[in-house]
Amino acid sequence: AMHVAQPAVVLASSRGIASFVCEYASPGKATEVRVTVLRQADSQVTEVCAATYMMGNELTFLDDSICTGTSSGNQVNLTIQGLRAMDTGLYICKVELMYPPPYYLGIGNGTQIYVIDPEPCPDSD
């Protein structure tokens, strides 16, 4: 099996942006890797975003994705934007070594992302 490491806690910025590193220990020489960010709330797991990349190439999420990222070796730097207080929760990094076979799955323990909505600016007279 494949070990995936990610930070336990991250605090989103006042602009609703959270970044964290997802690192995996590859048991083989994969050329195609898929990275997925999952959100776990209670026992429900939903997909936040996903990207497949070829080793040595850049990580590309879909245009409408709330995620961006860069990759370097077995390390992926993930950024999630547009977060609100209601999005506070556990975000799991899932890594799949897709090609060549065999397939390997790696699931991190999750990063608890805390999002605090900024206080509205007081009206000035």
Epitope: A1, V45, I107
Partner: antibody
């Protein structure tokens, strides 16, 4: 709710072909890996094949490699298993199963019986 | 290929008794990638436990899973009549995905 419905099973002679289908509903089909698992009469579960997301990544058990092909049509929310050069030992109930976000097989179809006999 | 060996092959117990099923892997399996399924005659398998110890949606708390490395256990604390079935463990951390040969829990 998630539903998987297999079809296409039947009786076929050794050496012939058969195509199984699995119609999926109740979830975003393209976001999940899909599997075929079979069970010979009175025996245990045997994983057969898997196909990922856009269909470009496929994996097969050694027992079917070179004979079976797995495909998916995301526009039709349907999974397929093309079985060629069938043998008596391929006789089994074939289930399709969804690979959940965390990897386990969280939903299964009711199965379709394939009997290979002359 | 990771080979999973389940024991015992058959477990004969009475309703209300505790059932302990074992699954041993030929090489280390992270607990994140070990599942248990229940199958009744003529039915498809049903997910009980994933990640070695997390109960699937709708599964009663009399079912629990534990273990790590190469040794995993499914425990049914008090057998109900509907629990008599065949149970399979599975690893899903790498291909090929593999299942144990199953343990049949039958009424004594």
């Amino acid at each position: 709710q998630v539903q998987l419905v297999e079809s296409g099973g039947g009786v076929v002679q050794p050496g012939r072909s058969l195509r199984l289908s699995c119609a999926a509903s109740g979830f975003t089909f393209r976001s999940f890996g899909m599997h075929w698992v079979r069970q010979a009469p009175g025996k245990g579960l045997e994983w057969v094949a898997a196909v990922w997301y856009d269909g470009s990544n496929k994996y097969f058990a050694d027992s079917v490699k070179g004979r079976f092909t797995i495909t998916r049509d995301n526009s039709k929310n349907t999974l397929y298993l093309q079985m060629n050069s069938l043998r008596a030992e391929d006789t089994a109930v074939y289930y399709c199963a969804r690979g959940g976000h965390l990897g386990h097989f969280d939903y299964w179809g009711q199965g379709t019986l394939v009997t290979v006999s002359s | 290929e990771i080979v999973l060996t389940q024991s015992p092959g058959t477990l004969s117990l009475s309703p209300g008794e505790r059932a302990t099923l074992s699954c041993r892997a030929s090489q280390s399996v992270s607990s994140s990638y070990l599942a248990w399924y229940q199958q009744k005659p003529g039915q498809a398998p049903r997910l009980l436990i994933y990640g070695a110890s997390s109960r699937a949606t709708g599964i009663p708390d009399r079912f629990s899973g534990s273990g790590s490395g190469t040794d995993f256990t499914l425990t049914i604390s008090r057998l109900e009549p509907e629990d008599f079935a065949v149970y399979y463990c599975q690893q899903y951390g790498s291909s090929p995905w593999t299942f144990g040969q199953g343990t049949k829990v039958e009424i004594k």
